[in-house]
Each structure stands twice: as C-alpha cells, then as structure tokens.
Interface confidence: medium
C-alpha cells in the first residue's frame, strides 16, 4: 500500500466554445480507495475552484457547462489524487477553450450524380455545417474534408474543400458503388470525427434527366 501515482490530464475538448470537458488518467491507486478532485483557476485570478460537474462526461472527467466556460481566458487545471497514505497532483494543464474545439461532424450529406454538357460524369457532394456551429456570424470559421472510396478499394481518397460546403468529384468508375463521408475543423481546433457514411452507385449508362 502506498500513496497514489501522479494523475495525468490527457484531454480537454469543447464541441462549441460554450462548454468543455477534461478527462484524466488516474495513475496507480496505491492499492487503496483513492479520491480524485479537479481544481482550476483562471489566468490573472487568485481564486481556485473545484470541478463543477464530475458526472455528465463519465468517469475521470469534469464537465464545464456554459455557466463555467469563458473563452480567451486561460484555465489552469490540475487533478489531485488522495488516499489514506498520501496524495499526488498532476502537472497543470493550461487551456484556452478557443483552441480545443472538436465539433460534431457536418450534417445533411447529399450525393448526386451529374453530367456536364460534354457527357462527363461527376459526383456532386453537398453538406451543411454542424448544427451547433454559428458560421454566419463568424463565431466559427469551418474547414471541411470529404473522403470517398469504392466498395472494393482499401484506401480512402481525401479532398480538402476549404470553407466550401460542396465538392465535385470527377473520374469515377461507372458501375461502382462509392462510400462518402465528411468532417470539419474550426479555424483553431481539431477535426471532427468522420460523419455518417453515405453511398451511391455510379450508373453504367448515365443519361441526363430533364
């Protein structure tokens, strides 16, 4: 039996700049029941506060609701582990919520096979920003990627589309079924997970509908 090992805060993420969550790895418990507490202060302030919500985001986590989230403020966050033999504290994590946004994936992915006047076929991929993202006001500037592959292929083909919410893919094989996904990233922050997969078959004998 021994004091607990040093915890490590391994991740903090915000879906929308309005709330965020931090998760920690506990380290060894020293063979004893061990309590964990997350405390934080804000840059330039003297007060230290305890995590407002240990439940919402699951075990070994702290959820900061709107009420507790400020942007352009550095949060200085530590996790303390305590058992009857002693305690240990994580290295501090210095977090600015502005930079830890991991949004939901884009929504309403639509796929349409189209044809140019010269009979060249292309796949028109369109989507919308994630619901929570206020793109219009400039609160978020979102960049996108799409990926696609034929059902037979092993590798995804990835296209960066910048701020565009549509993309045309040429040189697809007729008769093949293609899988398509999109993801997005705010100006500062992380790529979302890839969104729901959609599929479409490129017809063998495509003729333009009126």
């Amino acid at each position: 039996q021994s004091p607990p090992g040093k915890p490590e805060i391994h991740k903090c993420r915000s879906p929308d700049k309005e709330t965020f969550t931090c998760w920690w790895n506990p380290g060894s418990d020293g063979g004893l029941p061990t309590n964990y507490s997350l405390t934080y202060s804000k840059e330039g302030e003297k007060n230290t506060y305890e995590c407002p919500d240990y439940k919402t985001s699951g075990p070994n986590s702290c959820f900061f609701s709107k009420q507790y989230t400020s942007i352009w403020k550095i949060y200085i966050i530590t996790v303390n582990a305590t058992n009857e033999m002693g305690s240990s504290t994580s290295d501090p994590l210095y977090v600015d919520v502005t930079y830890i946004v991991e949004p939901e994936p884009p929504r309403n992915l639509t796929l349409e096979v189209k044809q140019l006047k010269d009979k060249k076929t292309y796949l028109w991929v369109k989507w919308l920003p994630p619901t929570i993202t206020d793109v219009k006001t400039g609160w978020f500037t979102m960049e996108y990627e799409i990926r696609l592959k034929s059902e037979e292929a092993d590798e995804w083909e990835i296209h960066f589309t910048g701020h565009q919410t549509q993309f045309k893919v040429f040189d697809l094989y007729p008769g093949q079924k293609y899988l398509v996904q999109t993801r997005c990233k705010p100006d500062h922050g992380y790529w979302s997970r890839w969104g729901q997969e959609k599929s479409i078959e490129i017809p063998n004998d495509f003729t333009l509908k009126d």
């Epitope: 991740k11 930079y99 830890i100």
Partner: antibody
Framework: EVKLVESGGGLVQPGGSLKLSCAAS????????MFWVRQTPEKSLEWVAY????????YYPDTVKGRFTISRDNAKNTLYLQMSRLKSEDTAMYYC???????????????WGQGTSVTVSS | DVLMTQTPLSLPVSLGDQASISCRSS???????????LEWYLQKPGQSPKLLIY???NRFSGVPDRFSGSGSGTDFTLKISRVEAEDLGVYYC?????????FGSGTKLEIK
C-alpha cells in the same frame, strides 16, 4: 511528469550535418507546439525553430532558415532538428522545449530538456 | 527583428532586498490578437532555463509570489520582492509575439 530528453549532439566539421532528437514523455505529445532553442558559449539564448502540434506549421529565424529543419513524429513522441551546412557560429547547447499552453494557443516555453551540446569545428 | 534590451546586465543584491530588472523591446510586442507574449525565464548555474512569468504578469505554476511582472507596449519589468539564495542566476526576457521570437541578453542576479 513532463520529461524532455535531447540527444544527437557532438563534434562536427564546418559544412557537415547533424540530427538532434528530443524524446518526450509525461504528456500527450501531439497536443503541443514544440521549440528548439540554443545557447551560445557566451550564454546568449536564440530561438531556432518551432513546429505546430500536427507538424504542418514550422518557423525559423533567418540565421538558420534553409539549413535547419524541425520535424516531429507524433507516433514516437519525438521531436527532431536536422542541421546541415553547419557553421562555427552554430556551436551551442541545443534545448528542446514544450509550449506551456495546451494545443494551439501561442507562446511560453513551459518545459525544457537538459540540452545537447553541438560543437562545429575543424 | 524585435530587439529586446535588458538592464542592468548585472544586479548585485543582498538577500531579502527587492530586485528589479527592466526589459525594453524595439517595437510594440502587442500581438494582433490583443495579447502581449512577454515572458521571463531564469537560468540557474548548470541548469536549463525555467519559465517564471508569461504574458507579462502571469506566474507559471509553482513560481513563488515574490516574483511579479508588469509593463505594456515596449517597457516591461520583473520584480522580486525579497531575494532568496535560490533566486540567483541569469534572468532573460523573451518576446513570442512576432516571428522571429527573440530573447534579451540576460541579467545576472548575484550576491552583493
């Protein structure tokens, strides 16, 4: 505990090359910008390079631009500095350091390694 | 490049005294995002530099409150309210607002 361990320094002739490594542990390496800083024998400090957490963004001062390349392998938790066309004025102790702030927020070298010595001399 | 000028180069003090180090930048180091990335580092003999203060006045975790930073624009000051033996070493200011980032030449704090 945040730990940075540099290696790869040594004696090299002018015009030669050297690759420094910095092994990182105790934190999620891929979430932090990283820096190389050097200290001359006269004890002046000079920022040499920085690299964004994903490796897509790098910056150098003019004194090393075109000769030095900073890179990282996030799978191996390792930072590198490839130095070529070395000059006597590159003789220094080379430190790797980690940005204080989590992810992309700018500034502050919160953690430093113990340094690795590079001597450029014929 | 932004030139960082530190004064004095050497600062002899008695233990318990207040010490003050000045750092002046050749141009404003207010970043376009409104922050001023002015930092202070202490290098003790035989050790690597350690961060003391970031963004002008914020103490790094574990740094005693006898250290304080102040200033704006181009003029910055590091104050140590009561010097202790463990504070001796070379202090460097650093600006991280404009590339290339630059250090001051250093101020050696030593016993009088």
């Amino acid at each position: 505990e945040v730990k940075l361990v540099e290696s790869g320094g040594g004696l090299v002739q002018p015009g030669g090359s050297l690759k420094l490594s910095c092994a990182a542990s105790g934190f999620t390496f891929s979430d932090y910008y990283m820096f190389w800083v050097r200290q001359t024998p006269e004890k002046s400090l000079e920022w040499v390079a920085y690299i964004s957490n994903g490796g897509g963004s790098t910056y150098y001062p003019d004194t090393v631009k075109g000769r030095f390349t900073i890179s990282r392998d996030n799978a191996k938790n390792t930072l590198y500095l490839q130095m070529s066309r070395l000059k006597s004025e590159d003789t220094a102790m080379y430190y790797c350091s980690r940005q204080l702030f989590y992810y992309g927020s700018r500034g502050a070298m919160g953690y430093w390694g113990q340094g690795t010595s590079v001597t450029v001399s014929s | 490049d932004v030139l960082m000028t530190q004064t004095p180069l050497s600062l002899p003090v008695s233990l318990g005294d207040q010490a003050s180090i000045s750092c002046r930048s050749s141009q404003s180091i207010v970043h376009s995002n409104g922050n001023t990335y002015l930092e202070w580092y202490l290098q003790k003999p035989g050790q690597s530099p350690k961060l003391l203060i970031y963004k002008v006045s914020n103490r790094f975790s574990g740094v005693p409150d006898r250290f304080s930073g102040s200033g704006s624009g181009t003029d910055f000051t590091l104050k140590i309210s009561r010097v202790e033996a463990e504070d001796l070493g070379v202090y460097y200011c650093f600006q991280g607002s404009h590339v290339p980032f630059t250090f001051g030449s250093g101020t050696k704090l030593e016993i009088k």
